[in-house]
């Protein structure tokens, strides 16, 4: 039975041209994490593998930075970066846990961070 939950940075906003950290935390399980995938809608942004380290998709190479931790830093944000982001935790023996983050990139200086929330 999958007992874990993923806590994410939730709904967040950031300014155009700035950067933002996407973070997820897997809790309430003793399952071993073997890999974390970061995706934007259907596109793979990055993979962090327990044995192989980081792989950043070539198309995002200049705007995505690995870390901190298993998180992902998005840089030089544009309005087109607005949308859903997913952290996908591959674990053994539980299987896959997915967390969702919604990022809104704003033109003005009214960006604020949303509250954390949990996804079972």
């Amino acid at each position: 039975m999958m007992t874990g939950t993923i806590e994410t940075t939730g709904n967040i906003s950031a300014e155009k041209g700035g950067s933002i950290i996407l973070q997820c935390h897997l809790s309430s399980t003793t399952a071993q994490v073997t890999q974390v995938n970061w995706e934007q809608q259907d596109q793979l942004l990055a993979i962090c593998n327990a044995d192989l380290g980081w792989h950043i998709s070539p198309s995002f190479k200049d705007r995505v930075a690995p870390g901190p931790g298993l998180g992902l830093t998005l840089q030089s944000l544009t309005v087109n970066d607005t949308g859903e982001y997913f952290c996908i935790y591959h674990t053994y023996p539980d299987g896959t846990y997915t967390g969702r983050i919604f990022l809104e990139v704003l033109e003005s200086s009214v960006a604020e961070h949303g509250a954390r929330f949990q996804i079972p």
Partner: antibody
């Protein structure tokens, strides 16, 4: 097995600059962040910043911006840190540390920097 | 910057004892906390990552717990080789920050 070999101790005059190295072996250099950490008896462990050799991207602690410059040479699997305008405050042990799936799982042995006036 | 507070600079213990080293973050860091052990003249070694996961090869007498702002490293059945300094670190946001360290000494 990953291994980080740092350059030897440095004794440098105040006002000068120094460049220390961290040679990585036993893993894919371009798949892990390389962090640099300063250790002094007074301030403990302080994070300076990191470089991701996969694309040369860097991220600095604001405190060390303009003081430290991080670079990497993927042909020799070596990360470098240059520290400029040296003062006695820069005397410390400097560590490089690998970070990927696990935080700071491999560290260099440290480079001792002594700044003399 | 997130401040990681290790309120005890020194802790006295005896071989066979159980000891708990605590660390408090100035804001929520989730479970992005690691614990390191450092012996004199050596570089730090990671013991615990993600607050509670033991790193490969670390003896099971080392246990990490906590989330949010309060974290604990527990060493059960302390051995003489455990006498060292222990640091917590948050890696939830930049700049990454460390606690000031807790030195474990013999009574």
């Amino acid at each position: 097995q990953a291994y980080l070999q740092q350059s030897g101790a440095e004794l440098v005059r105040s006002g000068a600059s120094v460049k220390m190295s961290c040679k990585a072996s036993g893993y894919t250099f371009t798949s892990y962040n390389m962090h640099w950490v300063k250790q002094t008896p007074g301030q403990g462990l302080e994070w300076i910043g990191y470089i991701y050799p996969g694309n040369g991207g860097t991220n600095y602690n604001q405190k060390f911006k303009g003081k430290a410059t991080l670079t990497a040479d993927t042909s020799s699997n070596t990360a470098y840190m240059q520290i400029s305008s040296l003062t006695s405050e820069d005397s410390a042990v400097y560590f490089c540390a690998r970070d990927g799936f696990y935080p700071f799982d491999y560290w260099g042995q440290g480079t001792t920097l002594t700044v003399s006036s | 910057d997130i401040v990681m507070t290790q309120s005890q600079k020194f802790m006295s213990t005896s071989v066979g004892d159980r000891v708990s080293v605590t660390c408090k973050a100035s804001q929520n860091v989730g479970t992005n906390v690691a614990w390191y052990q450092q012996k004199p003249g050596q570089s730090p070694k990671v013991l615990i990552y993600s607050a509670s996961y033991r790193y490969s090869g670390v003896p099971d007498r080392f246990t990490g717990s906590g989330s949010g702002t309060d974290f604990t490293l527990t060493i059960s059945n302390v051995q003489s080789e455990d006498l060292a300094e222990y640091f917590c670190q948050q890696y939830n946001s930049y700049p990454l920050t460390f606690g000031a360290g807790t030195k474990l000494e013999l009574k």
